[in-house]
Amino acid sequence: CDLPQTHSLGSRRTLMLLAQMRRISLFSCLKDRHDFGFPQEEFGNQFQKAETIPVLHEMIQQIFNLFSTKDSSAAWDETLLDKFYTELYQQLNDLEACVIQGVGVTETPLMKEDSILAVRKYFQRITLYLKEKKYSPCAWEVVRAEIMRSFSLSTNLQESLRSKE
């Protein structure tokens, strides 16, 4: 399955929207910095596109879940958030189209399940952090920056896979 060119453009638009969503300077939130344990190795160890698709799908699904809570709606600009949802939704559709073509997710191998669980654990730590910080503006800014970083890393993986094939 070849992900359409629009998928790459969508990823870039997603990053751009995340950047535009910034409301306060991260420098004013240095005391709130936190390591969420992004499982980077799960995005670097897979050499087959078929193996990465379920992991990328989980990553985008969890970003969608994180930003579609009522706490998130209160933290961000509604117009930007709506555009952000649209981009993520399109990317999920692209990845699911690959699944339907028989690549990846429906029969996830056990080793891929472990990668998916690593991604879930990472997002659970993010949600725990937000709860602990009572969804403060600084906490959301730390999370926004973290998602930009981790999404960018996973996007880079997609690009490197495309260039290999």
């Epitope: 989980e58 056990l110 690593a118 879930r120 659970q124 949600t127």
Partner: antibody, heavy 122, light 107 residues
Framework: EVQLVQAGAEVKAPGESLRISCKVS????????ISWVRQIPGKGLEWMVK????????IYNPSFQGHVSISVDKSITTVYLQWSSLQASDTAIYYC???????????????WGQGTLVAVSS | DIQMTQSPSSLSASVGDSVTITCRAS??????FHWYRQKPGKAPELLIY???NLQTGVPSRFTGSGSGTECTLTITSLQPDDFATYYC?????????FGQGTKLDVR
């Protein structure tokens, strides 16, 4: 096959230190939380603490914080529970458990070790 | 802490019977309810997760339902293996907590 294999029973005197172990196999060690659960003989279950083996990030039950500590050795896929000074009230069976996380990030304990009996008596 | 209260604390039944155990949480835990069975001298084992999902390998005679502050575990057509202690658990809030247990024995 997922396995959590715990060390054998321990008999200790009050004030002694102890470390019990849980060796895991059959899955990617760093992908799942591990918790310890206490069961006082004839009583119910109490969740104590959980750890992310990837970087040893921990969350404690406040009832146990400061009295026990959890740690991991990634090189041998083993999780530990440690006491620096045991009390008679620590007499219990201790289970290590693996967490599964659903897509909506609900934790549940899908695999349990066989348990380690710790008896503290003078 | 979220308190989990099981009822009854014990019950007697015969092979082939159906039984229902109820668990109440002191505040809403959504569907973050789970059920475990513990046979004498053994570690607990997962039966039902997220209130109503049957764990792989668990017989379909076990069913879970409910959400919010109350959930139930129903066992139909009791088998000799089912005489054990049952625990509910919530993982909605820290610390995670269990019910006090329901001991199911042979009438």
């Amino acid at each position: 096959e997922v396995q959590l294999v715990q060390a054998g029973a321990e008999v200790k005197a009050p004030g002694e230190s102890l470390r019990i172990s849980c060796k895991v196999s059959g899955y990617t060690f760093t992908s799942y939380w591990i918790s310890w659960v206490r069961q006082i003989p004839g009583k119910g279950l109490e969740w104590m603490v959980k750890i992310d083996p990837r970087d040893s990030y921990t969350i404690y039950n406040p009832s146990f914080q400061g009295h026990v500590s959890i740690s991991v050795d990634k090189s041998i896929t083993t999780v530990y529970l440690q006491w620096s000074s045991l009390q008679a009230s620590d007499t219990a069976i201790y289970y290590c458990v693996r967490h599964y996380l659903t897509q909506s990030l609900v934790d549940y304990f899908d695999h349990w070790g066989q348990g380690t009996l710790v008896a503290v008596s003078s | 802490d979220i308190q989990m209260t099981q009822s009854p604390s014990s019950l007697s039944a015969s092979v082939g019977d159906s039984v229902t155990i109820t668990c109440r949480a002191s505040q809403s835990v959504s569907n973050y309810f789970h059920w475990y069975r513990q046979k004498p001298g053994k570690a607990p084992e997962l039966l039902i997760y997220s209130a109503s999902n049957l764990q792989t390998g668990v017989p379909s005679r076990f069913t879970g339902s409910g959400s919010g502050t109350e959930c139930t575990l129903t066992i139909t057509s009791l088998q000799p293996d089912d005489f054990a202690t049952y625990y509910c658990q919530q993982t909605h809030g820290y610390p995670f907590t269990f019910g006090q247990g329901t001991k199911l024995d042979v009438r």
